[in-house]
Interface confidence: medium
């Protein structure tokens, strides 16, 4: 039901007297313009808001490393650098490393160099600005980057290819596998480790040298950023001469 | 080995102060948030009033905003709640806790100071 | 502010049994609901945090679940020294708001 011009309220007996002329709402009074608040919206300043933390998931994977983590988070006034912190597992708190802000969010970056497994569990983002404090817990898994247990088999070789079994499983480490690399060189050149990307446990390297030793091994790259995980157990093998059968 | 200690309880008159002190040990004082919160006899627990002495921030639930002043004195480790205008309704034992992470879970608790108003 | 709802208030179990408790937000608050024990005349302990995390110490009997505004808690065979009143409370914003407690009771 509504009231007369100018009253609010549960009975319409609150009279609004806006100070610039804003709109009477029958239900909170006064719509103060931006910049201005207070029941007739005589005060300037932009009511404080307590802080929300957004665009966090509740789970997150991460590969051993270098992880990254971001924290961002609204509220008036915007929270600063030092009101965003993060927190392990083991209480341990951390600032962020990098900060900016736009008109409605401030970012904070953190950065752990090294992230391992035992730093597996409830992660914290926590904000704490004037306008109220906020949390938002949230768990991460770290994985474990995958390894060959094995070097590559050499099934068959000619004078300028070689047939490989890459002998990916079994591995060290976590799965899912999302690709696999075959690593080559010959033992004997300075050249840099080449690369072919291999879908199939059977492989055929072509283009080899005739009469040169090759070392070969896998690496095993699982999902998410920095998922290559160290190359696998090293296997020597020898080109034929040309010529011979 | 973390404690909280609280001291200051005891009967005060209707508008009447009282001052109560959490003496904080065992761990990093400045890297925490310490809360109060209260229990009306045979009622739930209601949180009171926080602050963070990192930076001095403080907080405050309705019901005692006003008339509670929450501080800390990081050079003794101690956090204070003063209350004034005191009413009937503020009868509760008092407790203070910590969080180490500045936020709202409270994983130490003092053992509580009792706070009667009464004529 | 956010309400939080438990329930039951209170509960009549024996020892040995599996007992769970409830507790409703009134908005969404993520997964910052912790869980805390408390005896007569002594001060709550902490059991749960992040809804599903048991805090160090607890006994595996214990445990949390939920997100968003629906939680729970279970105690998995009820010991004698678990007859208590047990608190929700969310840490997700400012103010911090307590249920009104469980109080489980031997049958």
């Known amino acids: 039901e509504a009231c007369h011009p100018g009253f609010y309220g549960p009975d319409c007996k609150l009279r609004c007297s806006c100070n610039n002329g804003e709109m009477c709402d029958r239900f909170q009074g006064c719509l103060c313009s931006p910049g201005w608040q207070g029941l007739q919206c005589e005060r300037e300043g932009i009511q404080r808001m307590t802080p929300k933390i957004v665009d966090l998931p509740d789970h997150i994977e991460v590969n051993s490393g270098k992880f990254n983590p971001i924290c961002k988070a609204s509220g008036w006034p915007l929270p600063t650098n030092e009101e965003m912190t993060l927190v392990k597992p083991d209480g341990t708190v951390l600032h962020p490393k990098d900060f900016n802000h736009t008109d409605h969010f401030s970012v904070a970056i953190f950065t752990i160099h090294r992230i391992l497994p035992p730093d597996s569990g409830v992660w914290v983002c926590s904000v704490n600005t004037v306008a109220g404090m906020v949390e938002k817990p949230f768990n991460i898994s770290v994985k474990v980057l995958p390894k060959p247990l094995n070097a590559p088999n050499v099934i068959d070789t000619g004078h300028n290819f070689a047939v490989i079994n890459i002998s990916s499983e079994p591995y060290f480490g976590d799965g899912p596998i999302k690709s696999k690399k075959l690593l080559y060189k010959p033992v004997n050149h300075y050249e840099a480790w080449q690369h072919i990307q291999v879908t199939n446990e059977i492989v055929t390297l072509n283009y080899l040298e005739p009469r040169t030793e090759y070392e070969l091994c896998v690496q095993l790259v699982r999902r998410g950023e920095g998922g290559e995980g160290h190359p696998g157990p090293v296997r020597r093998f020898t080109t034929a001469s040309i010529g011979l059968p | 080995e973390v404690q909280l200690v609280e001291s200051g309880g005891g009967l005060v008159q209707p508008g009447g102060s009282l001052r109560l002190s959490c003496a904080a040990s065992g761990f990093t004082f400045s890297n925490s948030a310490i809360h109060w919160v209260r229990q009306a006899p045979g009622k739930g627990l209601e949180w009171v009033a926080s602050?963070?002495?990192?930076?001095?921030?403080?907080y405050y639930a309705d019901s005692v905003k006003g008339r509670f002043t929450i501080s800390a004195d990081t050079s003794k480790n101690t956090a204070y709640l003063q209350m004034n205008s005191l009413r009937a309704e503020d009868t509760a034992v008092y407790y203070c806790?910590?969080?180490?992470?500045?936020?709202?879970?409270?994983?130490?608790w003092g053992q509580g100071t009792l706070v009667t108003v009464s004529s | 502010d956010i309400q939080m709802t438990q329930s039951p208030s209170s509960l009549s179990a024996s020892v040995g049994d599996r007992v769970t408790i409830t507790c409703r937000a009134s908005?969404?608050?993520?997964?910052?609901v912790a869980w805390y024990q408390q005896k007569p005349g002594k001060a709550p302990k902490l059991l749960i945090y992040?809804?599903?995390f048991l805090y160090s110490g607890v006994p595996s009997r214990f445990s949390g679940s939920g997100s968003g505004t629906d939680f729970t808690l279970t105690i998995s065979s009820l010991q004698p020294e678990d007859f208590a009143t047990y608190y929700c409370?969310?840490?997700?914003?400012?103010?911090?708001?307590f249920g009104q407690g469980t109080k489980v009771e031997i049958k």
């Open positions: 409370q969310q840490s997700y914003t400012t103010p911090p708001t």
């Open positions: 806790a910590r969080r180490q992470s500045y936020s709202y879970v409270m994983d130490y």
């Open positions: 602050i963070t002495p990192y930076n001095g921030y403080t």
């Open positions: 908005q969404d608050v993520s997964t910052a």
């Open positions: 992040s809804a599903s």
